[in-house]
Each structure stands twice: as C-alpha cells, then as structure tokens.
C-alpha cells in the first residue's frame, strides 16, 4: 500500500491511498435519557446526540438507535466519558448490622455487538466504588483505547445506573470513535 | 482523494496526499503558574511548557500566551490531564449548621476560542466533587476527544482552582492535540 | 511527502506514502501477575496478554518481557488504564496519635526505556490518594498522550502496588500504543 516515484515504467500496482479526511469518524454528546426497555442482564445503553452542537458523524459512520455503526473494517480508537452525579451514598452506613455492605458503584462499559455473534463483547470498562461522605457528589469516568473492528459492528455505551448520568452539558458526557 | 495505479492513461486528478509526519501536533507540559489576570467569569487558564523535556510543537502548531493555535482546519484529537493536590477539604464539616454544604470540587475545561465568535466554546469538561477525609489528597482528571476545528481556532485549558494544580512533574499535568 | 496528479511529465520524486493499515499498533490486556524481581527504586512493571481476546500487536510492534518495542521512529499515541481494587484503607484512622497519616495512594506510570540512556523516562503518571471509608473499594486510573519515540525505545506500565491491580477482565486494565 505504498506509492513510490510514480513513473509509468513501474511494475507495481498501487492500492488506493485514502486521504485522512474521508475516514469514518463520530463524536456523540449526551442528551437527557428517556426510560426504555433494556436487554436482560445487561446495563442500559445510553442514547446520544449525533448532529447538534459539538456532535457529528461523517464518512459513512452512522448513529442509529443507541448504536454507532462501523462502516469499514480497520483499527479504531474508541472513547467515552460519562459524568455521574448523585445525591447520597449509603457508604457511611457501610458497617450497619455489624458487617460491611457492598459499596455503591458506578460503571461505564463500551460494548461491541456483532450480528453474527450471539453475545456482545465488552471492549472497555471503567468501574468505581462510590463512598462519599457528603450529601451530593459528582465525578467522571473516562475510557479510550484502540480496537480492530469489522464492517457492520455496532458500538454502544452502557452504564450501571442511567438515572445518575449527568446529561446537562455536551462536554461532560460523550462518546466517539475514529478509524486510524 | 485517492491515488490508484498511477499510469499516465488515468483521467483522475489526484488531490495532494499528505504524509502523516507533517501534520500539526503538540504536547505541552505543566509549569508552575504565577498569578495573572484571568478573563472575567471564566476559570483561569493554565500556561504551559512547549519545548523543554517531553514538550513539543510541530508542523505549524504553535503555542503562545496560554493558547494552542490551530494552523489548519480538520479533525483533531485533543487531550489533557490535570493532577490536583490539596491539603484540606471542608467535606468532613459538610453537615455543619444542620444543612449540607456544597462539596468542594475540582474542574478541568478544554476551551476553544474562535475570534469571529464572541463566546468561548467548552469542548470537554471533567468535574469532580472532593470530599476527602484525610488532611491531604491528590488526584488526576483526564479528558480526551475528537473535534472539528477551523484554522485560527485557539485552545486552552481552564481549571477551577489554579492553586491546586500539581506543577511538579511533566508527566502529571499536560495538554496536547494532533490532527487526525 | 506528497503525491499530486501523477503524470509522467512531473519532475518531483515522491517519497513513499504509507498506508495507515501498516502502521505499528498494539493493544495489550491484563493477565494475572506473578511475583517477579523489580528494579530497585522503581515501581513494579505489569506483564500483559498480547494475542488472546482483544489483545493484538501488528506491523512489527512487538511485546516481550513486559515491554512494548517501538519498531519505527515517529509520534505515537500511548494509553493505559489500570483498575485497582483494595479491601481496606487506613484512611479513616488518619488522625491516629493526634497527627494525620500520609494517605494511601495508587499510581500508574507509563515509562520509556532507551538502551542508550541510563535512566528510564516517565512519560505519563496518574496518581491518586485513596481514602475510602468503606471496607472495599475499586477505581480506574486512565492515561493517554502523544510522544515522539525512537526506533528501539521500549514502553512499560509500572504501578505502585501490583497486588491491588484488578486482573479479572481484559476491559478493565489494558495498555496500548499506535503510530500516528
């Protein structure tokens, strides 16, 4: 996949060299979540803004029904931040009844769904115990890494508790991917 | 924007294909902040090291006066980590006078300034309540995502409390961007 | 390093334009750590899975003996997440004997080793005080940034306490790098 001194006498056949600007890319931003049915035994998936404000999809990377659709096989960098906020944490009561409770927790998972494969694949997980002394708390979980994806794969972001997601600002909670 | 088997009989006109190595890129690292004037109603902006140690700017990406200057329109991945440290947190006093106080918090914002647009745009925000039992605490906030920027845009990193930024090591607090 | 309208009358000599798909890339995932000797005065390095599950190395980026080997000079994006989990934190006892203790902490460092240079270089550090009231806690530290690396450089991930690393899932603790 190289082009070298492109004189007609060369015997090589050159594979297409694509410009960076036409690679599939998306940056999605938070919207207020509405109650929906979730898959059984799976954290609920967030839905996203894909065209207003900072959000965009381009070059055949499409967003539909909580999923980013991968239009082309290759290595993608995938990232998300979810900001959580809560009013209370039972943590100070953690030793009630003489034994430690499980602490509250917040979790973000970026999940890949491949139609030909029965189970979703968890690509990235950020999980944190929440044990705040104060009456209200807020904090982000950030994730990002590179994965080899196939055309037709679908990506979504799942969270442990949709009601704790801070949906108030597009810069606080977001999800994106781009072909490398 | 593709080049295929470059024989003279081809009718296509090929747009320039740029080498990856000549794309605008920067990685800036922390320096100790000195008291300066800040924009009104905006968190203070950090200033940065741009050429010593791990820091660099290249291919027309320049740093000046707390801003990274975007030399070319396109999609950029932008990231920052700020490590905060504090010696106290009022959180243990949070229920003083029978009512909960607002918890202390730490916030990082990556902001875009476009000269033709009156208001800065907040691209990324990481914000966290700080409610530490101990007398001293430290923790990072990391941010990173992709944005479509225009030539002439300026990027800066704002923080809620400049006095809490850990300036001691270039690997703890940093800011970068690169054209995809 | 550009190729434009490749007609035979052009006098330019075109440098090779490489396809994105043949750039060095790796994504490594956590495995259970076995006790090993550590370098003196240095946090222990993690070892990684490099071919099973989500893990891969490609295009001459190799993994050997806790190190990612950089096969080609250039600008790389490097990232890691380490999820820590602990059973207790002495933090609630922080005012024992009338004076504050140093808080517990967790630290991740991405380190570069250059054979011709005597000292490793710390590229990225995420460090956090841990002062949890509850009896068990867990949380991730994420890092990522761009660095100019040389062929032959080696990258590793060091942690403050290997016994606190959550090795149970490949999506919780990982390490990667790719040439931009």
């Amino acid at each position: 996949l190289k082009g070298q001194e492109f004189a007609p006498s060369h015997q090589q056949v050159y594979a297409p060299l694509r410009a960076d600007g036409d690679k599939p890319r998306a940056h999605l931003t938070v919207v207020r979540q509405t109650p929906t049915q979730h898959f059984k035994n799976q954290f609920p998936a967030l839905h996203w803004e894909h065209e207003l404000g900072l959000a965009f999809t381009k070059n055949r990377m499409n967003y539909t029904n909580k999923f980013l659709l991968i239009p082309e096989s290759g290595d993608y960098f995938i990232y998300s931040q979810v900001t959580f906020r809560g009013m209370t944490s039972e943590c100070s009561e953690i030793r009630q009844a003489g034994r430690p409770n499980k602490p509250d927790s917040i979790t973000v998972v970026i999940t890949k769904v491949t139609d030909s494969y029965p189970e979703p694949t968890q690509l990235l997980m950020g999980t944190k115990s929440v044990c705040e002394v104060g009456s209200n708390w807020f904090q982000p979980i950030y994730l990002g890494a590179m994965f080899s994806l196939q055309e037709g794969d679908k990506l979504m972001v799942n969270v442990s508790d949709i009601s704790l997601v801070d949906y108030t600002k597009e810069d606080k909670t977001f999800f994106g991917a781009f072909l490398l | 924007l593709k080049g295929q088997e470059f024989a003279p009989s081809h009718q296509q006109v090929y747009a320039p294909l740029r080498a990856d190595g000549d794309k605008p890129r920067a990685h800036l690292t922390v320096v100790r902040q000195t008291p300066t004037q800040h924009f009104k109603n905006q968190f203070p902006a950090l200033h940065w090291e741009h050429e010593l140690g791990l820091a660099f700017t290249k291919n027309r990406m320049n740093y000046t006066n707390k801003f990274l200057l975007i030399p070319e329109s396109g999609d950029y991945f932008i990231y920052s980590q700020v490590t905060f440290r504090g010696m106290t947190s009022e959180c243990s006093e949070i229920r003083q006078a029978g009512r909960p106080n607002k918890p202390d918090s730490i916030t990082v914002v990556i902001t875009k300034v476009t000269d033709s647009y009156p208001e800065p745009t907040q691209l990324l925000m990481g914000t966290k309540s700080v409610c530490e039992v101990g007398s001293n605490w430290f923790q990072p906030i990391y941010l990173g995502a992709m944005f479509s920027l225009q030539e002439g845009d300026k990027l800066m990193v704002n923080v809620s409390d400049i006095s809490l930024v850990d300036y001691t090591k270039e690997d703890k607090t940093f800011f970068g961007a690169f054209l995809l | 390093l550009k190729g434009q309208e490749f007609a035979p009358s052009h006098q330019q000599v075109y440098a090779p334009l490489r396809a994105d798909g043949d750039k060095p890339r790796a994504h490594l995932t956590v495995v259970r750590q076995t006790p090993t000797q550590h370098f003196k005065n240095q946090f222990p390095a993690l070892h990684w899975e490099h071919e099973l599950g989500l893990a891969f190395t490609k295009n001459r980026m190799n993994y050997t003996n806790k190190f990612l080997l950089i096969p080609e000079s250039g600008d790389y994006f490097i990232y890691s997440q380490v999820t820590f989990r602990g059973m207790t934190s002495e933090c609630s006892e922080i005012r024992q004997a009338g004076r504050p203790n140093k808080p517990d902490s967790i630290t991740v460092v991405i380190t570069k080793v250059t054979d011709s240079y005597p000292e490793p270089t710390q590229l990225l550090m995420g460090t956090k005080s841990v002062c949890e009231v509850g009896s068990n806690w867990f949380q991730p530290i994420y890092l990522g940034a761009m660095f100019s690396l040389q062929e032959g450089d080696k990258l590793m991930v060091n942690v403050s306490d290997i016994s606190l690393v959550d090795y149970t899932k490949e999506d919780k603790t990982f390490f990667g790098a790719f040439l931009l």
Epitope: - | P35, H38, M87, D161, Y167 | -
Partner: antibody, heavy 118, light 107 residues
C-alpha cells in the same frame, strides 16, 4: 505587576481587636489563595492560615482558631485578617502573601506592625 | 503538625565562599519544601520551590536539593547581598510550617 499593599501600623491594648487589610492588584484576586503570616520581633515566621478569595473559604492554624477571622471583599480586591482578644505576644509584623500554587508564596505585602501594649 | 528543624541557626561566611543550610522535616514531605530569604525590615522573598526549582529572577548561585525529610539550600559563591536570614517552609500537609531560620552573617 502583582502588588500587595497592607494597611498601616496599629497600636492596640490587650483584649482589643485589630483588622489588617491587604489590597491586591496586578492579577485576578479571586484566583489565588491569600496567606497570612506573622513575625514577632527578632523571631521567625509563623503561618496563620489562608483564605480562598473566590469562595471565602478559610483554613486557620489550630492555635488561632476562634480568635482569627479572615475575610475578603472581592469588589475592591482586598483581604482582611482580624485578630481578637489581643495579648502582648501578638505583637508582630503581619504579612499577607500569595502565589501561583498553594505551596509557596511568590508575592508578599510590605507587612503591618501591630503592637499590643497596655 | 510537621516540624522543620533548620541547621545551623547561624553561620558566618566570606564573600565568594560557599554555604549549605539544611532543613529536616519531622515526617516525609515528598518535595513540598520552599526556601525564602529575608532581609531586616523586609518581607520574605521566595528563592526555591518544590525542593529544587529556582524561582524566576533568583540568581543561579542558589540551589536546593532533597526529598522526603532532608533538604539543603546551597549558595555557591556568596555575594554581599546574600547576607540575610533564610527560612524553609513545608507545604505537604496542613498547617504549613516554617523552620526556625538560619542567619547568614559576613565573616
């Protein structure tokens, strides 16, 4: 350039109160902690506490708790340190100081001499 | 509270000479130590922060080193204007505390 200008010298009787002011200029007053440090004649430096001008939050050294109050007026970029129930060993030069980080003070006021004498 | 012990409490030296002042903390303070110079009737002046970083505008003959509990301030080639009192100050944990001072006198 950054400047901290303190109020003039004071002479007070034991049991009285003193309020020292510190007017800041050349930087964003609300962006940086203001420390108060005192120095008794011929003695070393003693840190008293700080105020965060943005929120008005304070932290005082235990020794001064209940006797000291640090306040600010952001409209005139001024910090205040009030010390009550003065004793003769409160005779000292009182300094305000600020800096770009919590850990060290780049800029200091000229000092205010407070004499407590009956 | 963290105690800082400076030594010596006073030292005499000649112009052009070299002097080292030490500061010992009662517990580990990492690198959170600053050094100040104070001349009679004047406010202190920051010389060194984070144990070894030279404050802008301070001559390079001043240097700091150390971490943990043991720190030093070195003046490599004494100038007449360097004769003053020097204080260390920790900022690892609340409350901030100062050392007792070292008076540098001309020999």
């Amino acid at each position: 350039q950054v400047q901290l200008v303190e109020s003039g010298a004071e002479v007070k009787k034991p049991g009285a109160s003193v309020k020292v002011s510190c007017k800041a200029s050349g930087y964003t007053f609300t962006g940086y902690y203001m420390h108060w440090v005192r120095q008794a004649p011929g003695q070393g430096l003693e840190w008293m506490g700080w105020i965060k001008p943005k929120s008005g939050g304070t932290n005082y050294v235990q020794k001064f708790q209940g006797r000291v109050t640090m306040t600010r007026d952001t409209s005139i970029n001024t910090a205040y340190m009030e010390l009550n129930n003065l004793k003769s060993d409160d005779t000292a030069v009182y300094y305000c100081a600020t800096g770009g980080s919590q850990d060290a003070s780049d800029f200091w006021g000229q000092g205010t001499m407070v004499t407590v004498s009956s | 509270d963290i105690q800082l012990t400076q030594s010596p409490s006073s030292v005499s030296a000649s112009v052009g000479g070299r002097v080292t002042i030490t500061c010992r903390a009662s517990q580990d303070i990492s690198i959170w130590l600053a050094w100040y110079q104070q001349k009679p009737g004047k406010a202190p002046n920051l010389l060194i922060y984070a144990a070894s970083s030279l404050q802008s505008g301070v001559p390079s003959r001043f240097s700091g080193s150390g971490s943990g509990t043991d720190f030093t301030l070195t003046i490599s080639s004494l100038q007449p204007e360097d004769f003053a009192t020097y204080y260390c100050q920790q900022a690892d944990s609340f409350p901030l505390t100062f050392g007792g001072g070292t008076k540098l006198e001309i020999k």
